[in-house]
């Protein structure tokens, strides 16, 4: 193949690959017709003048995962056909000015995972056809104005995993064709107003894992084509009312891991394409009416691991397509009976790890398609009569780790659970907390005999059986939402003497090993 160096492999398709620790310089002679050259995992420490002079047809050059720390300015001379150049995963601290001069066809330049301390406008001034520039994983502390001014065709710019503490509002102003901008894992504390105004074609903006505390109200107002906005793991404590108002194409928004304390009504919207909204790990304490009302197509709403203690009855208005609602690990004590009324398509609701002490009888009244309900680790003592009767698709119900009060009032629930045991899972079953003499006994096993001295023996109402569908898919624990409202008495008062008999054959009921939470 026109003279392949012994340290390399050359294919008929004009592809050359040179790998191995024994290589300490660019191998020679390289086949003159090579179109793709890869130099990987070698001990090359520097590139001298014109090592690729005789392979002017080269289209792709990958020099990755080497010990490369120094490059002579003329190293890439005579590579006018080169479209793809990767110098990723080396030890470069400095780029010589003029290094990319003459690379008139270059479309992709990968400089990621080096030790670059700075870039200058002169570095990329010759790269007018560049479409992709990868600078992530370096040690850049600032980007000077003009650094990207000549890259008018750029569509993808990755500056993630650097040490940027601030961004000039002018640095991206000429990048009208940019579609992807990644600034994740830096040390940005704020983004100046106007920074993204020139990015009219931007589709993805990644700002996660910075230290951003405040978002300017009009920060995204010119980014009408934005589809993915990542703001998670910052220090954002509040959202300006209009900050998301001009993002009609948005289909992914992450805000988890911030310090949000409240969400104002209409803050999200209109976003007809948004399918998922991740708000876990914030400090949200309440949800007002209509806070999500513009998110008509939302299917997943994750609000777990906040401090939510109050949910307004109309908080979930408009979420007619919602499939999964996660409210677990909050501080909910009460839920209004109508709070989930609009969620006609809800399949999975997570309310575990809250402080719910009771649930209203109509809490799931209009949510007929529920398949999974997580209610474990609350403070429920009983549940209202018939609360699950209409949930024909329910195949997973988690009720363990609640302080169930196993007096005569528990009979309807106990009877329903007996008939619907497969839904409860096998590893953990609900156990009684009170009275003390039955503490720890399975709520399903326990036998409550009600002795009535009078001739008239009232019929004990039981939860009607809901058939269990074994072919319905089982959903894993996801997230939880919790809150309660008025306590609906599950059965009529029993004034008679109650005696409780207990069976202790726990192994029959799968109580040998508790499932970890």
């Amino acid at each position: 193949y026109h003279g392949c160096p012994s340290e390399c492999t050359c294919s008929r398709a004009s592809q050359v690959e040179c790998t191995g620790a024994r290589i300490v310089a660019v191998p020679t002679p390289l086949p003159w017709n090579a179109m793709s050259l890869q130099i990987l995992n070698t001990h090359i420490t520097e590139l001298n003048e014109s090592p690729f002079l005789n392979i002017s047809a080269l289209i792709a050059l990958r020099i990755e995962k080497n010990e490369l720390s120094r490059i002579t300015p003329g190293a890439f001379r005579n590579l006018g056909s080169l479209r793809y150049l990767s110098l990723a995963n080396n030890k470069l601290q400095v780029l010589p000015i003029g290094l990319f001069q003459g690379l008139d066809s270059l479309e992709s330049l990968l400089l990621s995972s080096n030790q670059l301390l700075q870039i200058q406008p002169a570095h990329f001034s010759q790269c007018s056809n560049l479409k992709e520039l990868q600078l992530h994983g370096n040690h850049l502390e600032y980007i000077p104005d003009g650094a990207f001014d000549h890259l008018v065709g750029l569509t993808k710019l990755n500056l993630g995993k650097n040490s940027l503490t601030h961004i000039s509002p002018r640095v991206f102003q000429h990048l009208g064709n940019l579609q992807v901008l990644r600034l994740y894992e830096n040390r940005l504390t704020d983004i100046p107003m106007g920074t993204f105004d020139g990015l009219v074609n931007l589709q993805e903006l990644a700002l996660q894992q910075n230290q951003i505390g405040l978002l300017s109200p009009g920060l995204f107002h010119n980014n009408h084509n934005l589809q993915r906005l990542y703001l998670s793991n910052n220090h954002i404590s509040q959202l300006p009312p209009s900050v998301f108002m001009q993002l009609p194409q948005l289909n992914r928004l992450t805000l988890f891991g911030n310090s949000l304390k409240e969400l104002s009504p209409g803050i999200f919207g209109p976003m007809p394409n948004l399918r998922e909204l991740w708000l876990y790990d914030n400090h949200i304490s309440s949800l007002p009416d209509n806070v999500f009302s513009n998110l008509r197509q939302l299917q997943v709403l994750i609000l777990s691991r906040n401090q939510i203690s109050f949910i307004s009855p109309g908080a979930f208005n408009g979420l007619t397509e919602l499939r999964e609602l996660s409210l677990h690990t909050n501080a909910l004590q009460d839920l209004d009976g109508n709070v989930f009324r609009m969620l006609a398509n809800l399949q999975n609701i997570s309310l575990q790890n809250n402080r719910l002490r009771q649930l209203p009888g109509n809490i799931f009244a209009n949510v007929n398609g529920l398949m999974a309900i997580q209610l474990q680790n609350n403070q429920l003592e009983n549940l209202p009569l018939g609360i699950f009767d209409h949930l024909g698709k329910l195949c997973e119900l988690r009720l363990y780790d609640n302080p169930w009060r196993c007096d005569s009032d528990i009979l309807p629930l106990r009877n329903w659970l007996l008939l619907n045991q497969p839904r409860l899972g096998t590893d953990t079953v609900p156990v009684c907390f009170s009275p003390a003499n039955v503490r720890g006994q399975s709520l399903i096993i326990i036998n409550v005999n009600v002795a009535v001295p009078s001739v008239h023996v009232p019929e004990v109402p039981s939860y009607p059986e809901t058939p269990w569908y074994p072919d319905t898919p089982s959903y894993p624990d996801t997230t939880s939402v919790s809150s309660t409202t008025e306590l609906t008495s599950p059965v009529e008062d029993y004034t008679d003497l109650t005696t409780i008999q207990v069976t202790d054959d726990r192994s029959v009921w799968g109580m040998t090993q508790a499932q970890s939470g």
Epitope: D401, V429, V431
Partner: antibody, heavy 120, light 112 residues
């Protein structure tokens, strides 16, 4: 007879981790929750967390990132794992349960405690 | 988190006299549906583990002498020892469980 016995305390270097055990007898961990509470010398009580019968856990929010409570039902043992220890974690560590009380978060049976000292 | 503030820090009372300890919560501990105040009182004698005395603000734990009583609702609570005995010398703690538990700073009761 209900008993809770803590072990695993001792001297730990700052930045290190500890794993305390609470061996219980007289009741089953599949039926009762177990809390961890600590008390620095001459100071007040601080609730750390709880593991319930079914394995769910709750933690003190200020310590959550450094705490893990787990258990082995078959061994009748509950564990407290704490990472990134600092001098302020020096304390007596107790485990406790709700044996008779009607208060779900009440702690009416306590161990005698195990002392943890964080110092270089 | 709910902050529990006890007063006084220490209290010296003559044998047979009444001792009163106050506990104030930063948030109401009354659940309007269950109509319970989620407040408990613990006693810790020198060198011993704590002991649960009272829960739901006023319900005495079984075996606790009736000289101990709890009162209050919402954010203000009181533990009263109607006739102090020598064996009551201890530190007393209030604890809320409306949210995840937090203890008060403690009140030391001594004999005058």
């Amino acid at each position: 007879e209900v008993q809770l016995v803590e072990s695993g305390g001792g001297l730990v270097q700052p930045g290190g981790s500890l794993r305390l055990s609470c061996a219980v007898s007289g009741f089953s961990l599949t039926s009762y929750g177990v809390h961890w509470v600590r008390q620095a010398t001459g100071k007040g009580l601080e609730w750390l967390g709880v593991i319930w019968a079914g394995g769910s856990t709750n933690y003190n929010s200020a310590l959550m990132s450094r705490l893990t409570i787990s258990k082995e039902n078959a061994k009748s043992s509950v564990y407290l794992q704490m990472n990134s220890l600092r001098a302020g974690d020096t304390a007596m560590y107790y485990c406790a349960t709700h044996m008779i009380t009607e208060d779900y978060y009440g702690m009416d049976y306590w161990g005698q405690g195990t002392t943890v000292t964080v110092s270089s | 988190d709910i902050v529990m503030t006890q007063s006084p820090d220490s209290l010296a009372v003559s044998l047979g006299e009444r001792a009163t300890i106050n506990c104030k919560s930063s948030h109401s501990l009354l659940n309007s549906r269950t109509r319970k105040n989620y407040l408990a009182w613990y006693q810790q004698k020198p060198g011993q583990s704590p002991k649960l005395l009272i829960y739901w603000a006023s319900t005495r734990e079984s075996g606790v002498p009736d000289r101990f009583s709890g009162s209050g609702s919402g954010t203000d609570f009181t533990l009263t020892i109607s006739s102090l005995q020598a064996e009551d010398v201890a530190v007393y703690y209030c604890k809320q469980s409306y949210n995840l538990p937090t203890f008060g700073g403690g009140t030391k009761v001594e004999i005058k």
